[in-house]
Each structure stands twice: as structure tokens, then as C-alpha cells.
Interface confidence: low
């Protein structure tokens, strides 16, 4: 015997109170697959969240974040404060990257400048809080007497800030 509820399409639910008739999802609810016995409540994008896609009878609302914040987590489960380039978000708010580190995005952490000398290269362009160093040719590629320098890279785990 076929389950009569299997005939209920997305956007409806199988109403046990009405002899398993397919009833439309009530306002502010949805069912994204057929054969559902209930409709799910639509997500509401409140506060720092804003609506990216309205809820429909067959799909949930989608949220993103208001300006100055960015999404974190699956399906934008949380909004996290943006910082400026050259900063990272600390427990005390946005703070400038320490010397020897950079962050070229409005989110994430300050990362150590590339150590050009590890690849046998020299620093072509110095790093800043917002930008990594640019490595140039190896020092041996320079003619004698050409100055070449490498920037020190702070200690600590790769991809994490030191002071």
C-alpha cells in the first residue's frame, strides 16, 4: 500500500487532522520536499542579520549580514564584526596587525610576512600591515654590490600572529 502522504508535493504537508489531505504550508513556514507531515518554520533574519532570500512555501529564507559584519558558520549562522585591512578582531575589538604580520581582508587573522630567504629570495617590496612582502630574485641573481635584504619573520605557528 502506498503512503497517501507521498503524494503531497513540496510546499504542502500531509494533514492528519483532515484525513491526510495535502494542505498548503501556513504563512511563514515551508516544506522543501514532498511527503512531509509538517512544515518547517521560516528562518527570520533579525537584528544584525538581513534577508538575502525571502522564505517561500518550498524554501527557507536565507540571511546575510548587515554592512560592517560578515557571515560565519554554515548557512550564515552568525554575523561577525568586520575589521579594516591591516587589523584582526581580538577580544577587545579590532586591533592593528603587529609588525611583521599582515591581513589583506576585513576578516580573519593577521599572518606573518613571507620569509623570502627560506626560498633563497630577497625582499623586492617590503610588507605592510595590509600587504605581504613581495619576494624578488635570489640574492645570487644580483650583480656584485647590489644591496639585498630580507625581512625577519616573527616566530609562532604558520599563519598566526606574533609580536
Amino acid at each position: 500500500l502506498q503512503d497517501p502522504c507521498s503524494n503531497c508535493p513540496a510546499g504542502t504537508f500531509c494533514d492528519n487532522n483532515r484525513n491526510q489531505i495535502c494542505s498548503p504550508c501556513p504563512p511563514n513556514s515551508f516544506s522543501s520536499a514532498g511527503g512531509q507531515r509538517t512544515c518547517d518554520i521560516c528562518r527570520q533574519c533579525k537584528g544584525v542579520f538581513r534577508t538575502r532570500k525571502e522564505c517561500s512555501s518550498t524554501s527557507n529564507a536565507e540571511c546575510d549580514c548587515t554592512p560592517g559584519f560578515h557571515c560565519l558558520g554554515a548557512g550564515c549562522s552568525m554575523c561577525e564584526q568586520d575589521c579594516k585591512q591591516g587589523q584582526e578582531l581580538t577580544k577587545k575589538g579590532c586591533k592593528d596587525c603587529c609588525f611583521g604580520t599582515f591581513n589583506d581582508q576585513k576578516r580573519g587573522i593577521c599572518r606573518p610576512w613571507t620569509n623570502c630567504s627560506l626560498d633563497g629570495k630577497s625582499v623586492l617590496v617590503n610588507g605592510t600591515k595590509e600587504r605581504d612582502v613581495v619576494c624578488g630574485p635570489s640574492p645570487t641573481d644580483f650583480s656584485p654590490g647590489t644591496p639585498s635584504t630580507t625581512m625577519p619573520v616573527p616566530g609562532g605557528e604558520p599563519g598566526h600572529t606574533s609580536h
Partner: antibody, heavy 121, light 112 residues
Framework: QSVEESGGRLVTPGTPLTLTCTAS????????MIWVRQAPGEGLEWIGD??????TTDYASWAKGRFTISKTSTTVDLKMTSLTTEDTATYFC?????????????????WGQGTLVTVSS | DIVMTQTPASVEAAVGGTVTIKCQAS??????LAWYQQKPGQPPKLLIY???TLESGVPSRFKGSGSGTEFTLTISDLESADAATYYC??????????????FGGGTEVVVK
């Protein structure tokens, strides 16, 4: 790399006490350092922390005013005042896994063995 | 303040079995959750951070999952050495989040 707590002892209620966490093999200026305590048979209780890069501190609401965290280049101190019997515990110091001020780095993989503070009359 | 709540307080399982420990945050902490193991007379040991990233040297029998407010630590193929108390720690400090205690209350795992 290691951290070691010292200064724990038996004191009477009301006595101030300062615990010291000594770092070996790394510089405190790169890390979050945390103080946590554990009463006998109880769970871990966060007291507060200091970020070595900026010397900024943060405290649990219950610890504010009575506990003060400060640092030198190689030590982190926990100064405690108005001690009561409820403060009897093993006090742990720990260092963050990663260097840097981002709170994404606020997990701790280097712990001391703890120092026991007993407050009794 | 964000409150970290662990359940159950104690769980018992046989060698080779599986245990599941739950940690609930009173508001969303995204994926900023860590798990620690503590044995009697020892300091805590970091097992997992950012919800599911294993600390180096931690066996893959330990698995972390979840996001937002609900998190789970699953220990499979239990060994007697896994007998310990396990703590979760929330560390999402965005939006001026506060914690009275960043650690959960702990779950004792007894291995039979």
C-alpha cells in the same frame, strides 16, 4: 616550552596572595595567557587572562576587583585579595596554542601542573 | 553572559564502546568550541579546537561536531586510557560576548 605556577600555600581568610606563572622557551608577549582554578573535586573555573602583546586583561565577572593579572617579559602574576575558604583550589596557568591577538587563537595547549592554594582559619 | 552547559555529568561505557558528550552554549558561538581531557592530578589537555580540528597527537577516535549552540564530542573504540573528565570551552568573543566561565561543567567518562 613550559609554564610553571608557584606561590600557592596555606593562608588565613582575608590574606592577600600572589601566584606567579613562569614561562620557559617562549616569550609571553606573543600569546594569550590564562588563569583557571579547580576546587577539590570540582570543574574548571576561568578566572581571567592577559594578552601579552598589549597587556590587556579580561576577567570573569565574579573575579573582577578581587583578582588582578599582570605580566613581565617572562612571568604572569595573579594577585588575589580578600581570600575566603571558597577560593581553596588548584590554580593553573596556561598558554594559548597560537600566538596572536585574534580571539580565534583562544585555546590552550600548554598548561602548568598547578599550584595549590588553601584558605583556612 | 554566555553559559556553557555539558551533559551528561557522568557516563559509563565498556572498552571498545562509544560515548557521546554534549555541550550547549546559551547563545551562538559559531564554531569557536574546544574540548579538553583531564585526568586526576593532571592539568587539562587540549583535544579539539574550532569544533572539529584535532590537536596533534590526538587519535582520530575523538571526533568533534556541531555549530552555533549545540556541540558534540564522540569517543569511539573506547580504551581504558580514555577514562577522564572532559570539558568544553567556548571562545567566541565577538560582539562583546562575555563568559562567566568559558568552560563547561565537565563530563566524567568511566570505562568498564
Amino acid at each position: 616550552q613550559s609554564v610553571e605556577e608557584s606561590g600557592g600555600r596555606l593562608v588565613t581568610p582575608g590574606t592577600p596572595l600572589t601566584l606567579t606563572c613562569t614561562a620557559s622557551g617562549f616569550t609571553i608577549s606573543s600569546y594569550h595567557m590564562i588563569w583557571v582554578r579547580q576546587a577539590p573535586g570540582e570543574g574548571l573555573e576561568w578566572i581571567g587572562d592577559i594578552y601579552g602583546g598589549t597587556a590587556t586583561t579580561d576577567y570573569a565577572s565574579w573575579a573582577k576587583g578581587r583578582f588582578t593579572i599582570s605580566k613581565t617579559s617572562t612571568t604572569v602574576d595573579l594577585k588575589m585579595t580578600s581570600l575566603t575558604t571558597e577560593d581553596t583550589a588548584t590554580y593553573f596557568c596556561a598558554r594559548a596554542r597560537y600566538s596572536g591577538g585574534s580571539y580565534a587563537n583562544y585555546v590552550f595547549n600548554l598548561w602548568g601542573q598547578g599550584t595549590l592554594v588553601t584558605v583556612s582559619s | 553572559d554566555i553559559v556553557m552547559t555539558q551533559t551528561p555529568a557522568s557516563v559509563e561505557a565498556a572498552v571498545g564502546g562509544t560515548v557521546t558528550i554534549k555541550c550547549q552554549a546559551s547563545q551562538s558561538i559559531s564554531s569557536y568550541l574546544a574540548w579538553y581531557q583531564q585526568k586526576p592530578g593532571q592539568p587539562p589537555k587540549l583535544l579539539i579546537y574550532r569544533t572539529s580540528t584535532l590537536e596533534s597527537g590526538v587519535p582520530s577516535r575523538f571526533k568533534g561536531s556541531g555549530s552555533g549552540t549545540e556541540f558534540t564530542l564522540t569517543i569511539s573504540d573506547l580504551e581504558s586510557a580514555d577514562a577522564a573528565t572532559y570539558y568544553c570551552q567556548g571562545y567566541d568573543w565577538s560582539s562583546s560576548n562575555r563568559y562567566d566561565n568559558t568552560f563547561g561543567g565537565g563530563t566524567e567518562v568511566v570505562v568498564k
